[in-house]
């Protein structure tokens, strides 16, 4: 007989998730309405396509990227979809409450859905560090806390540091990475005897993870350009992101081979490193004046990513209990920092070039912005980690980590747990 959810979780999850969904429906009923204005239909279609690209990145890209575990691939993909669906709903409301609410109702536009999808993406990046060690009820908590923390961070940053939509959203890489790592740090770490094989990657799930990486690779330019407000900015962002990810692919594959004693290529390195350039140019993608700079950034990002994948997993596994194949967290944390540093360098060059004073003050503001993003990520991540450790959620036993059978019905399996 196939395994069942523990009784308590069977009671807890549907009740918790459906009550939450009912609450969201009520909030939408009382506080939202659609944008009633007449749209230019061509513009509407173009705007929808950007949102569609982001949804593909989230549902297929990040969904499959995290599916490389031997016995946890179903859960990775489906839990990602569940978190995305829930995260988008809450993010739309939260963004509306934080930015529009004083005027009455929250107006829902394609742009607000775009923003919400990007906010929900944050959770999908973070969750890579904890997938396999938590159940759906715990993931609901993680979605709510992280989306709320990111929404508030974006509002605080836009108000205090006066940054536009693009800039305050591009902290998502650093925020999501540090949030995920701090949640992982709070969860039970040691993998008990007999479960080591479960966090290993298998060929078919690894292939689906590569498929996820390919989708992300294709659509990363859309993500980096989605919130820019002019065609020339979007064009620069698309071009620079494309050049950066193209170079990071070449670097990832050749660097992975270089890092192996027999010159073999590691699937895990490649899954993650192909995206390195996109993360590194994210913040400054619209400011980089020529392709060669974006390409150099892609090269450096690819090398950092491969280097990180080679040397950091041991440390992360010991300290945070993150399996070797879940390298998105520390990868994004390093590459996000690289991207922020590049932005500050470009800002200094631009300020010097314009002959304006206050360079030191500008740099201080940028560093303050980055520091605030990291601090809020760590604090909210620790809070989430502590919440997830509460007995109420009936977390999977360590022996059931990285196991689809705990959550899914497999009629063809005779042996249960």
């Amino acid at each position: 007989m196939s395994s069942k959810y523990p009784r308590s979780v069977r009671r807890c999850l549907p009740l918790w998730a459906l009550t939450l969904e009912a609450a969201l429906i009520l909030l939408f009923y009382f506080f939202t309405h659609y944008d009633a204005s007449l749209e230019d239909q061509k513009g509407l279609v173009a705007s929808y396509q950007v949102g569609q690209d982001l949804t593909v990145m989230a549902a297929i890209g990040l969904g499959f990227l995290t599916s490389s575990f031997r016995r946890h691939s179903w859960s990775s993909v489906a839990f990602n979809l569940f978190m995305l669906a829930l995260g988008v709903q809450w993010a739309i409301l939260l963004d509306g409450f934080l930015s529009q609410f004083p005027s009455g109702k929250v107006v829902i536009t394609l742009f607000s859905i775009r923003l919400a999808t990007m906010s929900a993406l944050s959770v999908l990046i973070s969750v890579d560090a904890v997938l396999g060690k938590v159940n759906l009820a715990q993931l609901v908590v993680m979605v709510l806390v992280e989306v709320t923390a990111l929404g508030n961070l974006r509002m605080v940053i836009s108000n205090i540091f006066n940054t536009d939509y693009h800039m305050n959203m591009m902290h998502i890489y650093v925020f999501a990475a540090y949030f995920g790592l701090s949640v992982a740090w709070c969860l039970p770490k040691p993998l008990p005897e007999g479960t080591e094989d479960k966090d290993q990657t298998a060929t078919i799930p690894s292939l689906s993870a590569m498929l996820g990486a390919l989708f992300l690779w294709m659509f990363w330019p859309s993500f980096n350009s989605a919130l820019l407000r002019s065609p020339i900015e979007r064009k620069n962002a698309v071009f620079n992101t494309y050049y950066a990810v193209a170079v990071s692919v070449v670097t990832a594959i050749s660097g992975s081979s270089l890092a192996h004693p027999q010159g073999k290529i590691s699937k895990t390195y490649v899954h993650s490193a192909v995206l390195a350039g996109g993360v590194a140019v994210g913040t400054s993608c619209h400011l980089i004046p020529s392709p060669w700079l974006a390409m150099v950034l892609g090269l450096v990002a690819g090398l950092i990513s491969v280097g990180g994948a080679k040397y950091l997993p041991g440390c992360c596994n010991r300290v945070l209990g993150i399996p070797h194949s879940s390298i998105m967290g520390y990868n994004f944390s390093l590459l996000g920092l690289l991207g922020e540093i590049i932005y500050i360098v470009l800002l200094v060059l631009d300020t010097v070039g314009a002959g304006n004073g206050m360079i030191g003050f500008q740099v201080l503001l940028s560093i303050g912005e980055l520091s605030l993003a990291i601090v809020i990520a760590l604090m909210s991540g620790l809070l989430t980690g502590l919440l997830l450790n509460l007995k109420i959620w009936k977390a999977p036993h360590e022996a059931k980590y990285f196991d689809d059978q705990v959550f899914w019905k497999f009629p063809h399996l005779a042996v249960g747990f």
Epitope: E39, S47, S99, F111, N162, S230, L287, A354
Partner: antibody, heavy 121, light 111 residues
């Protein structure tokens, strides 16, 4: 050369609606964000609303939020401002302006000559 | 509610130099507020002069220059001409949405 021509102004009673238009020529309209700015008689300029180049996002000043709607038709090279629930304090000359947004550059570049809206009973 | 403050009026002699400033109630003005300056003469539409702190439009005379001074945006006119007598407005962009807020305007008189 760049030309912006506002129309649709006039005298209207409080609580009624009015729709302003801004016809653009001499540049690629669909590549530019557009703004409405107003100026009450004898007073300073007040920013009203912005719409992005593709119409995907719009934002408003608090004083008009929920009452005014900015929209555009790129195929007609026209910008609109739908004004509902008009008040006496909405009396002003309304200007449309193009937005330059590139990297770390932001500007209201070209302005129309304006159209006068008078809200009076 | 954000307030942008300018000097209500300034007087300058022809050929002289004058600096108009623009302060924000939120604190120091930086290049991230993209300060813009406009000139408006009676009965005319505003005309853009300076954008993004110090950049000039193709039609902006060389005697106009923009900068940041002590946490404020500044517009400096060197070698003032009689035709520079006008109202000058600054515009700052705020927050994620980059909403515009104009200053109250400075009436420049050339005596």
């Amino acid at each position: 050369q760049v030309q912006l021509v506002e129309s649709g102004g006039g005298v209207v009673q409080p609580g009624r609606s009015l729709r302003l238009s801004c016809a653009a020529s001499g540049f690629t309209f669909s590549n530019y964000g557009m703004h409405w700015v107003r100026q009450a008689p004898g007073k300073g300029l007040e920013w009203v609303a912005v719409i992005w180049f593709d119409g995907s996002n719009r934002d408003y000043a608090d004083s008009v939020k929920g009452r005014f709607t900015i929209s555009r038709d790129n195929s007609k090279k026209t910008l609109y401002l739908q004004m509902n629930s008009l008040r006496a304090e909405d009396t002003a000359v309304y200007y449309c302006a193009t937005e330059l947004a590139r990297g770390r550059l932001r500007a209201l570049e070209y302005w129309g000559q304006g159209t006068l809206v008078t809200v009076s009973s | 509610q954000t307030v942008v403050t300018q000097e209500p009026s300034l007087t300058v002699s022809p050929g002289g130099t004058v600096t108009l400033t623009c302060a924000s109630s939120t604190g120091a003005v930086t290049t991230g507020y993209y300060p813009n300056w406009f000139q408006q003469k009676p009965g005319q539409a505003p005309r853009a002069l300076i954008y993004s702190t110090s950049k000039k439009h193709s039609w902006t005379p060389a005697r106009f220059s923009g900068s940041l001074l002590g946490g404020k945006a500044a517009l400096t006119l060197s070698g003032v001409q009689p035709e520079d007598e006008a109202e000058y407005y600054c515009l700052l962009f705020y927050g994620g949405a980059q909403l515009g807020v104009f200053g109250g305007g400075t009436k420049l008189t050339v005596l």
